[in-house]
């Protein structure tokens, strides 16, 4: 039975020294930067148990930046998980084999040299392959502050099997009250996934008014369960300008 060896390949160690200088002039300092940001766009990784996770933060800078990893904002050491992990400095990656539910969390790469520091966070969820409740990427939708008359885009990143139903809701007031007689908040349905809804994960508001300030909710459900995350919209306006409040028919958020 072939068992994995604990040793890393020498080729993967980042043992490169600073660039050789042909004269006495030092190379221009460069703060760290991402070399392939398009390969870092997938932030939410929902992975079945026992599979391998690889997070990459390809970077560069002068002098060569260092790479370290945090889990949930704290120093991440190999003995923090069964089986440890491998850092491949040459490819700016971390590899965790045979993931288990306790590996769930936020993993942050920090790339730094004496001229700057950059970081990027990935979200790992360890899932059952059988149908599960929807999972939403942390931090989305994000709070927005915009000027009166601007356009606004809220985004909700969803991972779901089976097919999810996505709703965008806004918390509203009815007769000065935010809560209905059944103790549920009043909400207005702004958008939902369906035949006429393209790109349900995005809510776009055009030419916003002050009345559209408030809390917006991305609510995602399937037959297993549901998840929701919210964000606040703040619309700023010049002084002395008043806008009438818009009243719409209320619904309850269950």
């Amino acid at each position: 039975d072939a068992l994995p060896s604990s040793e890393d390949d020498d080729d993967d160690d980042d043992s490169s020294s600073e660039e050789k200088e042909t004269d006495n002039t030092k190379p221009n300092p460069v703060a760290p930067y991402w070399t392939s940001p398009e390969k870092m766009e997938k932030k939410l990784h929902a992975v079945p148990a026992a599979k391998t996770v690889k997070f990459k933060c390809p970077s560069s800078g002068t002098p060569n930046p260092t790479l370290r990893w945090l889990k949930n904002g704290k120093e991440f050491k190999p003995d923090h998980r069964i089986g440890g992990y491998k850092v491949r400095y040459a490819t700016w990656s971390i590899i965790m084999d045979s993931v288990v539910p306790s590996d769930k969390g936020n993993y942050t790469c920090i790339v730094e040299n004496e001229y700057g520091s950059i970081n990027h966070t990935y979200q790992l969820d360890v899932v059952e392959r059988s149908p599960h409740r929807p999972i939403l990427q942390a931090g989305l939708p994000a709070n927005k502050t915009v000027a009166l008359g601007s356009n606004v885009e809220f985004m909700c990143k969803v991972y779901s099997d089976p097919q999810p139903h996505i709703q965008w809701l806004k918390h509203i007031e009815v007769n000065g009250s935010k809560i209905g007689p059944d103790n549920l908040p009043y909400v207005q349905i702004l958008k939902h996934s369906g035949i006429n809804s393209s790109d349900a994960e995005v809510l776009t508001l055009f030419n916003v008014t002050e009345a559209q300030s408030g809390e917006y909710v991305c609510k995602v459900s399937n037959y297993i369960g549901e998840a929701n995350q919210s964000a606040w919209l703040t619309v700023t306006r010049p002084a002395l300008e008043e806008r009438p409040a818009v009243m719409t028919s209320p619904l309850y958020l269950e």
Epitope: D8, K39, P48, A50, T52, K56, R88, S98
Partner: antibody, heavy 116, light 109 residues
């Protein structure tokens, strides 16, 4: 060390159902592994059929999904493959295997011929 | 679904270095595993997680993975290395295990 042994009929009639079982010895089927079936038609490459976790969670090759069922029997420490509506194109050596992201243990394989 | 592309055959003289490639869209973001299969035998894992070797596999076998290509390198090739070699990934997007089409390594002479 873990060992895997495939068993089942070596000849199946067209339109029938291919049924194979993989006995796991030297380890528990409830370990943090996926239990896979992989096949290899004569003179061709490896084709992943599907896999199962001890919880019963499964994943199947999309090209075979409508015909495949993989199940696990923890009490017998074994897992099974059923492939329905077989044709001559399903003639292959069938391997059971244990893996995570990669496969570290394979059975020796069993040749299944589809013929009338 | 995800596709892995391997050259059908690679030939090399004994003592030389053989390189077998495995192409896939942004494969560098995945962990690539390599298997050796000799005629009439089950496959054997020779490299996992891009470049790690299981115990018992000679140091002559090494791997790398970047961009759209993963590579299995066999240095100081021996006659006993003649076999079919397959790359494999677990495609995280489709949640499926995927094999490359295989490469037949021929050791000349």
């Amino acid at each position: 060390q873990v060992q895997l042994q495939e068993s089942g009929p070596g000849l199946v009639k067209p339109s029938g159902t291919l049924s194979l079982t993989c006995a796991v010895s030297g380890g528990s089927i409830s370990s943090n592994n996926w239990w896979s079936w992989v096949r290899q038609p004569p003179g061709k490459g490896l084709e992943w059929i599907g896999e199962i976790y001890h919880s019963g969670s499964t994943s199947y090759n999309p090209s075979l999904k409508s015909r495949v069922t993989i199940s696990v029997d923890k009490s017998k420490n074994q897992f099974s493959l059923k492939l329905s509506s077989v044709t001559a194109a399903d003639t292959a050596v069938y391997y059971c295997a244990r893996g995570t992201d990669w496969i570290d243990t394979w059975g020796q394989g069993t040749l299944v011929t589809v013929s009338s | 679904s995800y596709v892995l592309t391997q050259p059908p055959s690679v030939s090399v003289a004994p003592g030389q270095t053989a390189r077998i490639t495995c192409g896939g869209n942004n494969i560098g973001s995945e962990s690539v595993h390599w298997y050796q299969q000799k005629p009439g035998q089950a496959p054997v894992l020779v490299v996992y997680d891009d470049s790690d070797r299981p115990s018992g596999i000679p140091e002559r076998f090494s791997g790398s993975n970047s961009g759209n290509t993963a590579t299995l390198t066999i240095s100081r090739v021996e006659a006993g290395d003649e076999a079919d070699y397959y790359c494999q990934v677990w495609d995280s997007t489709s949640d499926h295990r995927v094999f490359g089409g295989g490469t037949k390594l021929t050791v000349l002479g």
